[in-house]
Interface confidence: medium
């Protein structure tokens, strides 16, 4: 049924879904703080533009009686229940912020007549790609996939002279929500990554992973996994690793690697870490001071969701356009807005673009160093360290298949 939106006559409301099941175990209080900080900034920006309007957020809490696992596995119905609650109360805002779980976002998008924009901090899975009124403010799996294919094909860098076409993917089912969907995308036989690779096998057991490290008959030298360094250590420990093995550790939302006092442990020498370029001011900002790196990105996405709404509201009001129209609902894409920590770019499908950074461990300094960066907006790789002090022979990344000559 058509729900009237509290979204006119100088009063504009944001509906924020505060779901018990969330992509990250962030206390809802922290998310409220992030939203409230965003509201303060938006009000200031609108006032500066001479727009005398009211912007508020309504936090919609789930009762938590049925969907109480705390993670994304029971989020599907919780999202729909919250929408029903909104519908019954006739309390829909101009925009919906949340949910963060892929399951709930997919189902809500499927089961509702969306005449309003949805902004998500999460919804990483491929099933949430290409949704006309959905905006995602944390890097979705599609972006990771495009980087990996781009990097695999690259063969004209001083430190990577072979294009790769093979990979193992380690996926044991205990991953965090972001990793779960990133690895799902790599595993899916119909995905771009699978389509572009000649050989790909998913390793599901610790022993499979451990055996590959020294197996002379392995079909690829490259293993992709997702998580923090401690996740890798639990798996690999201090085991010997063949000299031409390359482990790609996807750890996007972890900016510790860039901190001054961080030294890379010895077991990271065969590892390239893929992470996101850290924000400028976040480490000391008031809303994020006590959050771990992952949580900082999650809370920041909520805050940026508010700023994105403020940006669109300002544009539509300045142009004298109606907010409760399909045009507004479809407008949250193909743009750059001023986020909390600098400009934020959304692609044609409303997904955030970012700079991914590939790090290696310097054998000289034992520090993480930037090998290259990748701009997801233009799908382009930019080498940074032309003479890396790698552990690999000749300071070059090995071929992905042992014994194969130059490609």
């Amino acid at each position: 049924s058509q729900v009237s939106q509290n979204c006119h006559n100088g009063s504009y409301e944001i509906s924020v879904l505060m779901m018990g099941n969330s992509a990250f175990a962030e206390p809802l209080k922290n998310l409220e703080d992030a939203v409230n900080e965003g509201l303060e900034i938006v009000r200031g920006r609108l006032q500066n533009a001479g727009l005398n309007v009211t912007v508020n957020a309504t936090f919609m809490y789930s009762d938590g009686l049925i969907h109480n696992s705390g993670d994304c596995r029971s989020s599907t119905c919780e999202g729909l229940d919250l929408l029903r609650k909104i519908s019954n109360a006739q309390r829909m805002g101009c925009v919906l912020i949340g949910p963060s779980c892929t399951y709930s976002t997919f189902q809500m998008y499927l089961d509702t007549e969306l005449s309003y924009p949805m902004i998500s901090a999460g919804s990483f899975g491929l099933s949430c790609d290409y949704k006309e009124t959905l905006t995602r403010l944390m890097s979705p799996a599609r972006k990771l996939m495009y980087f990996l294919v781009n990097f695999w094909k690259t063969n004209d860098l001083p430190f990577k002279t072979y294009s790769w076409s093979t990979s193992y993917v380690y996926k044991n089912g205990t991953e965090t929500e972001d990793c779960f969907w990133y690895l799902n995308a790599l595993e899916a036989s119909v995905s771009y990554f699978s389509h572009e690779l000649g050989f790909k096998v998913v390793l599901r057991q610790d022993k499979e992973f451990q055996d590959i490290l020294m197996d002379h008959n392995r079909k690829s030298n490259v293993i992709i996994m997702c998580g923090g360094p401690e996740f890798l250590y639990k798996l690999k420990g201090d085991r010997a690793v063949a000299e031409d093995i390359v482990i790609i550790l996807v750890d996007l939302f972890n900016d510790q690697y860039f901190e001054d006092n961080v030294t890379a442990p010895d077991y990271m020498k065969n590892v390239l870490v893929l992470t996101l370029s850290p924000g400028n001011s976040l480490l000391n900002s008031s809303f994020s001071r006590n959050l771990s790196p992952t949580k900082r990105d999650f809370a920041l996405a909520y805050l940026n969701g508010i700023l994105l709404f403020g940006h669109m509201l300002k544009i539509f009001l300045e142009n004298g356009e109606n907010i409760t129209t399909p045009k507004f609902a479809h407008a949250f894409r193909n743009l750059t807005f001023e986020g909390y920590d600098g400009p934020v770019t959304l692609d044609d499908w409303g997904d955030v673009d970012s700079t991914m950074v590939l790090l290696y461990t310097s054998v000289d300094t034992k520090k993480y160093k930037v090998l290259l960066t990748y701009d997801t907006h233009v799908n382009k790789t930019y080498p940074v360290d032309m003479s890396p002090t790698f552990t690999w022979k000749n300071s070059k990344l090995p071929n992905d298949i042992t014994g194969r000559g130059p490609q």
Epitope: A25, D71, T176, G228, N254, Q256, E259, A264, S292, K295
Partner: nanobody, 127 residues
Amino acid sequence: QMQLVESGGGSVQSGGSLRLSCATNEPPYSIYCMAWFRQAPGKARERVAAILNAGGTRYADSVKGRFTISRDNAAKTFALQMNSLKPEDTGTYYCATRADAGRWGSACTTELDFGNWGQGTQVTVSS
């Protein structure tokens, strides 16, 4: 189950130093995060310092610049070096660890984020 044993507590004059140590039965690199908490008489337990999975460190505002958290993988220990101690640093110090991120992450900020705790070691700073 991970075992944690603290040592190094004691009595010291204001301005003095102590080094607390936390011995584990697992290598520190395999731990998602580790923290030192303290509890003063009649007060809630507070997180003083934490070391995260990649080696990033976090400190309470009240100890920044005075305390340093570190880990020694070979010796299977975490340490808290406490310099320029003040009477308000008095309390029981506990080390706590969390083994992994779990299915949906962990902030490593509150007591609830940590599953393994030591017995505690007493620190007394007199003026």
